[in-house]
Each structure stands twice: as structure tokens, then as C-alpha cells.
């Protein structure tokens, strides 16, 4: 009886694992083995595919074959008993194009209200992704074990921290890799679960803000308790993108080590131009808080996002405010080459009731004022870019009296 050649050959490539699967064409024939040959582009001869010779099952692994993953190859298969079937040729393919990204390795660390996720490629020193290893980004799905309500987090790097979690709560997550340059989305990792710790005695500092005063940066934060000492550390933001790097070498800001106030001042020349991450930790001498959430700090924007300068033209029932470019030391105007939005706060001098106007324009009318009344105005600028959500400090307040009731010009 003639042996039929096998059919429906599937090539599965995950990372550096090359798997072939096929269907037997004749289930009734026993003791059949299968063998594969391969052919590289531009070659006439077929070569025996090591790892896939005289196979009794319908699956084989040819991962040991050292292929150029960017080069097209062709496969053929036949069945063998006493005689052999004809060859069945598989459509040619390029391994890299066919390859899927395997599940990444995930390692979790817990704090009371945060989880640190370390992610690394599932295959160490992968040949398939050798040229793309630095381009991996990851996304994850996280949920409380008790509720199952999922939250997705996209575009994260090899180490990511999730904040604002509940203490003593089990969270589960799964992670997958992507190579956006090659339009490849990977396979999810197994589900990993971790329980956050009991609530720490000391909470981390909150609401960290950086502003510029004279030639200094002023870093401020909020803290629940008094009589604490604080330390501040910085890190180059680009280091977060380095996939092989699990050691983030956070550095102390010398003027912000063991400070006893909820702010510290340090010279602008501490930082060269660039984007940094900052974090703050509190201590009462016996206990230490976990680190605060990291804030992004861009020296370019921070240095130049100075409070706006404005002139007021007073009328009887309104102010006309003309916003100009802020002045640097030396009285030269600063060129702001990104769109700004202005927040104007005004109040009656004798009252604490503040009113607010948000405007994109640089000429603003403050309406509904009382005649012959002193009003005070202060303003600050915000960047309109969500990613670089920065605000200047408020300008000094300027107080003016409205004109008598009959003037409207």
C-alpha cells in the first residue's frame, strides 16, 4: 500500500523555540515515522532537519538548528515505513516574521500600598530578538484577587511600580511583551499573585512639586506628621528604559539629605539638562516610610516655566490683564516655545474668597468687579501637554483699585 504524505504542517515559533506539528494522513497505518528536510533561499539541495528525523509522534522541535532568523527557509516532510511517501512541501517562511514573543518572566515585590514588578524576557539572550532586545515594552493586566475587576496598564518598561493599592490585599497580574517596531504582541505570562504588606506606620510623603526660585530649585511635599526628617533621591529617567538594568542607582541630593522641613532648596546646577525622577522618604528616627511616588522632573520645562508677568488696566467693573513673557535675571524675556494655559486668581483685598479664571489667551478680562474696590491678582502658567504636566509658581500678587462707577472706558 502506498504511504500518503502528511498534511497540514504547522510551524510554531515562540522566542527561540521552533516546533513543527502535522496530521497523519492515514491513521490506520501503524509504526509510521516522519522526517523533514529544509532548504535555505538560493540553495538547490535539501538538508536533513536535525531533531526532526524518524519521528514517531506528530510533533518535533528543531530549535537546535542555528538558522539565520531573517532568512527565508522551506521545509518538506514525508512519511516512512518500509517505503516512503512523496514529499509534502510546506510554504516557505522567514522565522523572524513567524515568531511570536513568549511569556515574559515576572518577579514581584510588595510594599503596603504598592507593588514593584520586575519583567525580563522569557528567553535569556534570545537569538530571535537579539537585535530588538532593547525595544521590548510590556503591558499588564492587574486585578484584586477578591474582585476580579481588571485594570490595564500599557507601555511599561522592565521595572514598574504600581501605587495606590490597599494594604493586606492580594493582587494578581499577568504581563505580555510587545515589539512595536515589528508589530508583534507577545503571549501573556502565567498569572502571578502577591499580597501587599500590613500598613506601614509611616506613610510616604505626597504631592511632590518642583518650582524655580532665583537660581534654585525648590522641592516641596506634604507630610502627615511633624518632627520628621526627609531625604530626597534622583535618577536619570532614561535608565528606566534599559531592559537589562534592574539596579536603579538612585542618588542623594546633598542639600536634601536629612532635612527637617517639608521642602528643600538646591542649586539648579545640581542637574544638567535632562529628565529626572525624584522620590522622597520620611523617617522619625525609629521608623522609615516607603519611598513616595516618583515624580518626573524635566529641567528644560522646569527652568523656563517661570510665573507670568502681567499688567492690569483698571476699569470700574473689571480688570483687563495683559500677560507677557516672564523675565529672567538680567530682565530679558524668556521665550516659551510650548503652549501655555494661564490660571488667574483674584480676590477682594479685604476678603479671603478667591475666584479663578483659566485662559489660553494672553489678554484676559476679569469681570463683575465693584467700583472703587481694591482687588488683588496673581497668576501662574501651566503646560498644556499632558505628559509634561508642569505648573509655574504663582506670581507675586498685584493689587489695584477699580475706577469710580461711571467709567467704562
Amino acid at each position: 500500500k502506498n504511504l500518503k504524505s502528511p498534511q497540514k504542517v504547522e510551524v510554531d515559533i515562540i522566542d527561540d523555540n521552533f516546533i513543527l506539528r502535522w496530521n497523519r494522513s492515514d491513521e490506520s497505518v501503524g509504526n509510521v515515522t516522519f522526517s523533514f528536510d529544509y532548504q535555505k533561499t538560493g540553495m538547490d539541495n535539501w538538508i536533513k532537519l536535525s531533531g526532526c528525523q524518524n519521528i514517531t509522534s506528530t510533533k518535533c522541535n528543531f530549535s537546535s538548528l542555528k538558522l539565520n532568523v531573517y532568512e527565508e527557509i522551506k521545509l518538506r516532510i514525508r512519511a516512512e515505513k518500509e517505503n516512503t511517501s512523496s514529499w509534502y512541501e510546506v510554504d516557505s517562511f522567514t522565522p523572524f516574521r513567524k515568531a511570536q514573543i513568549g511569556p515574559p518572566e515576572v518577579h514581584l515585590e510588595a510594599e503596603d500600598k504598592a507593588i514593584v514588578i520586575h519583567i525580563s524576557p522569557g528567553t535569556k539572550d534570545s537569538v530571535m530578538w537579539a537585535l530588538d532586545g532593547l525595544s521590548f515594552t510590556y503591558s499588564l493586566v492587574i486585578w484584586k484577587n477578591s474582585s476580579g475587576v481588571e485594570e490595564r496598564i500599557e507601555n511599561i518598561y522592565s521595572r514598574h511600580k504600581i501605587y495606590k493599592l490597599s494594604p493586606e490585599t492580594t493582587y494578581c497580574l499577568k504581563v505580555k511583551a510587545a515589539l512595536l517596531t515589528s508589530w508583534k504582541i507577545g503571549v501573556y505570562s502565567p498569572v502571578h499573585c502577591i499580597k501587599t504588606t500590613v500598613e506601614n506606620e509611616l506613610p510616604p510623603p505626597e504631592n511632590i512639586e518642583v518650582s524655580v526660585q532665583n537660581q534654585n530649585y525648590v522641592l516641596k511635599w506634604d507630610y502627615t506628621y511633624a518632627n520628621m526628617t526627609f531625604q530626597v533621591q534622583w535618577l536619570h529617567a532614561f535608565l528606566k528604559r534599559n531592559p537589562g538594568n534592574h539596579l536603579y542607582k538612585w542618588k542623594q541630593i546633598p542639600d536634601c539629605e536629612n532635612v527637617k522641613t517639608t521642602q528643600c532648596v538646591f542649586p539648579q546646577n545640581v542637574f544638567q539638562k535632562g529628565i529626572y525622577l525624584l522620590r522622597v522618604q520620611a523617617s522619625d528616627g525609629n521608623n522609615t516610610s516607603f519611598w513616595s511616588e516618583e515624580i518626573k522632573f524635566d529641567t528644560e520645562i522646569q527652568a523656563f516655566l517661570l510665573p507670568p508677568v502681567f499688567n492690569i488696566r483698571s476699569l470700574s467693573d473689571s480688570f483687563h490683564i495683559y500677560i507677557g513673557a516672564p523675565k529672567q535675571s538680567g530682565n530679558t524675556p524668556v521665550i516659551q516655545d510650548y503652549p501655555l494655559i494661564y490660571e488667574i486668581i483674584f480676590w477682594e483685598n479685604t476678603s479671603n474668597a478667591e475666584r479663578k479664571i483659566i485662559e489660553k489667551k494672553t489678554d484676559v478680562t476679569v469681570p463683575n468687579l465693584k467700583p472703587l474696590t481694591v482687588y488683588c491678582v496673581k497668576a501662574r502658567a501651566h503646560t498644556m501637554d499632558e505628559k509634561l504636566n508642569k505648573s509655574s509658581v504663582f506670581s507675586d500678587a498685584v493689587c489695584e483699585k477699580t475706577k469710580p462707577g461711571n467709567t467704562s472706558k
Epitope: E109, K249, K251, F290
Partner: antibody, heavy 118, light 107 residues
């Protein structure tokens, strides 16, 4: 293969100083922190401090501030622990260890025995 | 400084038994705890990092658990090769600190 090779045993007189070395192979010390740990005979482990060989930044346990000085030389892939004003209390085995922020102290040197005796 | 307390200095067990070595931190250290095994005349051998992750090559008889302030190293199916001292260490805050050690003796 990753290894930390420490210098040999030292016998020194009280009041003197000693410098112990720890040379890394199979990795670049600049990419890690190198820590030093003290162990007295039949005792526990005491953390002395660490260095970031990339820029020389150090941290010390308060107890060893003034006693220990940690330095490094990236050209020879070596970290050093210098101990000054030695007393019998400094007689111990000193270990260096590598830290990568993920696996904690994943590789240790074989230890250097320091004996302070007149 | 954070104090790591291993209350049992010595523990006696038999081959095939299961034994738990405990370690208590004086304040919350998250899961930044490692465990080391040390045999006489040798340097400490890393067993566990991040509370529960085994280093490669460490038999799965060794498991770590806990979080916050209470941590445990469990050795199941104890072997005579496990006769050693075991140290916990916190690396959440400087100065890093070790427990005093627990010496495992085989009956």
C-alpha cells in the same frame, strides 16, 4: 563565570591599617554595587557598607563610619575595604558581595581573614 | 536601624523532616528579605531573595514566605547536607541588616 576573588589572609598589629581587595571576573563591577560584610568567629553577619563603582558613591553602617573606607578601581574591576586604627575587635572574616537590585547578594567572595594581634 | 531577630539560635531536626526558620523585622520591610545558608569555613550561599524567590540551583525543598515584618524559611525533607547556619537579611533600608543566624543540627 561570575566570581569575586578576595585577597589573602592578613595578620596586622593593633593601631595599624589594612586594605583588603575584591576583584570581579565575568562581569563589570560598574554595573553593580559591591558590598562588604564582617563576620567574627562563630558570630553573625554585619553589613559594613557598599560602593557604587561607577561614581565612587558610598554608604556605611553607622557603626563602621570612620572605621571603614570603601573604594574601587574600575580599570582593574576591583573594590577595596580599608580598615584603620585596628583593634582585636576587628579580627574577623570580611566578605565582599555583588548586588544587582534584583537578586540581592547573588555572588560572594571567598572571604579574607584578618587577625589583629601584637 | 532595622533589627532582624532570629529568635531560635539552634534548631534540631531529623533527616526527612520539615523545619521552619523564622525571622522578625523591627519595622515593615516589604518583601525585601533574603536568606543565606552558611557552612563552616565557607562564604554565605544565597538561597532566597525577595522573600520567596529561589536562586537558580537551589533545591525546591527550600521555600521562603512572609511579608512586612514576619518571614519564614521552610526546609522540607531535610537532608544531612542542610546542616548549616541560616541567616535572614533585610535590604529595604540602609543600613542593610542580618539576623543573628539559626544553626540547624541534624539529630
Amino acid at each position: 563565570e561570575v566570581q569575586l576573588q578576595q585577597s589573602g589572609a592578613e595578620l596586622v598589629k593593633p593601631g595599624a591599617s589594612v586594605k583588603v581587595s575584591c576583584t570581579g571576573s565575568g562581569f563589570n563591577i560598574k554595573d553593580y554595587y559591591i558590598h562588604w560584610v564582617k563576620q567574627r568567629t562563630e558570630q553573625g553577619l554585619e553589613w559594613i557598607g557598599r560602593i557604587d563603582p561607577e561614581d565612587g558613591e558610598t554608604k556605611y553602617a553607622p557603626k563602621f563610619q570612620g572605621k571603614a573606607t570603601i573604594t574601587s578601581d574600575t580599570s582593574s574591576n576591583t573594590a577595596y575595604l580599608q580598615l584603620s586604627s585596628l583593634t582585636s575587635g576587628d579580627t574577623a572574616v570580611y566578605f565582599c558581595a555583588r548586588y544587582d537590585g534584583y537578586y540581592c547578594f547573588d555572588y560572594w567572595g571567598q572571604g579574607t581573614t584578618l587577625t589583629v594581634s601584637s | 536601624d532595622i533589627v532582624m531577630t532570629q529568635s531560635q539560635k539552634f534548631m534540631s531536626t531529623s533527616v526527612g523532616d520539615r523545619v521552619s526558620v523564622t525571622c522578625k523585622a523591627s519595622q515593615n520591610v516589604g518583601t525585601n528579605v533574603a536568606w543565606y545558608q552558611q557552612k563552616p569555613g565557607q562564604s554565605p550561599k544565597p538561597l532566597i531573595y525577595s522573600t520567596s524567590y529561589r536562586y537558580s540551583g537551589v533545591p525546591d525543598r527550600f521555600t521562603g514566605s512572609g511579608s512586612g515584618t514576619d518571614f519564614t524559611l521552610t526546609i522540607s525533607n531535610v537532608q544531612s547536607a542542610d546542616l548549616a547556619a541560616y541567616f535572614c537579611q533585610q535590604y529595604n533600608n540602609y543600613p542593610y541588616t542580618f539576623g543573628g543566624g539559626t544553626r540547624l543540627e541534624i539529630k
